[in-house]
Amino acid sequence: QSSLTPLMVNGILGESVTLPLEFPAGEKVNFITWLFNETSLAFIVPHETKSPEIHVTNPKQGKRLNFTQSYSLQLSNLKMEDTGSYRAQISTKTSAKLSSYTLRILRQLRNIQVTNHSQLFQNMTCELHLTCSVEDADDNVSFRWEALGNTLSSQPNLTVSWDPRISSEQDYTCIAENAVSNLSFSVSAQKLCEDVKIQYTDTKM
């Protein structure tokens, strides 16, 4: 990737990622420097007849760093702080080629939950107020609520009225997704409204 347009690479928290390096064809490489946010990560001197010299200069990421045979950077056990700008400089006798990358760390979504604050009106209509959440949600998580294939809400919250006298059994499903994972959780309107009805009759007695 040229330095003008960094290659955006997605990594998953806790997993591994490779930043691919392309070599100038037919040129002898003198050394390669890898940088993270403009700080040196590693300095590599290739040898034709023996193993390359690899000097890891960033102790923080050092134990999680590896290099492929073509000196692409492999980073394992990814952490959120690995997010940022990476650059590789390949120096030959005649030129220096720069490759740029932007690494984005995404979380696998975990622990989807639905909370319910519902009301029963005197006409026996049940108004459902549902809120969907996942652990450590960020701005890259999309939420939506669906029923019978229709999207009823594009937010973590759903407000909907359900009348047991005219509506058949109805499931509402929250779907949370990001670029690397998706989770869903379904709730039954009938069950939720029955629970509210029990509470309602208990308080009336």
């Epitope: 890259n140 609520w145 809400s153 937010q155 407000t159």
Partner: antibody, heavy 118, light 106 residues
């Protein structure tokens, strides 16, 4: 039917403020996020950010932090975009657009032209 | 942010011809949405989640792709298809649009 109706064109002087409205009808307003999109003359579409119509919490794209404010009046199913300290480069058509999920904008307002000129 | 590059910038074709336009993302995205815009009008939803046609969109339109490469195809151009088509990604904030492909009459 489902629609978003925006307020009319505005001509403003640099440094002034403007408030664009977007009135929703035909659906439960608080169930769908409202996005704002800018299109400068002859330019591409730029996503400005969105507001959660249930909680009222806005989220702004980096280029639109500071002078741009999203707000709601849930009692009249209306979203607002306010721009302060207007500059000539704010001259554009501003669209509101409903998010149907996965940030797919299935319903758009007709657009409000804001012209900033001295 | 994820940059979406659309190509070609302009497609000059005649009615009845096949149109294919590309949208390339600077990073892998899960799905792509497409919108049609005509001069002086708001964009209209056209294709959502890569391959699903929006309500009222004719079957001559199709969408495909995955990862970083997505395509919108019009099998046989009709006069009303001449417009600008924008792709848009949702996988990462900020949501970004491509620069558009203008389909014009040759």
């Amino acid at each position: 039917q489902i629609q978003l109706v925006q307020s009319g064109s505005e001509l403003k002087k640099p440094g002034a403020s403007v408030k664009v409205s977007c009135k929703a009808s035909g659906y439960t307003f608080t169930n769908y996020g409202m996005n704002w999109v800018r299109q400068a003359p002859g330019q591409d579409l730029e996503w400005m950010g969105w507001i959660n119509t249930y909680s009222g919490e806005p989220r702004y794209a980096d280029d639109f932090k500071g002078r741009f404010v999203f707000s709601l009046d849930k009692s009249v199913n209306t979203a607002y975009l306010q721009i302060s300290s207007l500059k000539a480069e704010d001259t554009a058509v501003y669209y509101c657009a409903r998010d149907y999920g996965r940030w797919y904008f299935d319903v758009w307002g007709q657009g409000t032209t804001v012209t900033v000129s001295s | 942010q994820i940059v979406l590059s659309q190509s070609p910038a302009t497609l000059s074709l005649s009615p009845g011809e096949r149109a294919t336009m590309s949208c390339r993302a600077s990073s892998s995205v899960s799905h792509m949405h497409w919108y049609q815009q005509k001069p002086g009008q708001a964009p209209r939803p056209w294709i959502y989640a890569t391959s699903n046609l929006a309500s009222g969109v004719p079957a001559r339109f199709s969408g495909s792709g995955s990862g970083t490469d997505y395509t919108l195809t019009i099998s046989s151009l009709e006069p009303e298809d001449f417009a600008v088509y924008y792709c848009q990604q949702w996988s990462s904030t900020p949501r970004t649009f491509g620069g558009g492909t203008k389909v014009e009459i040759k």
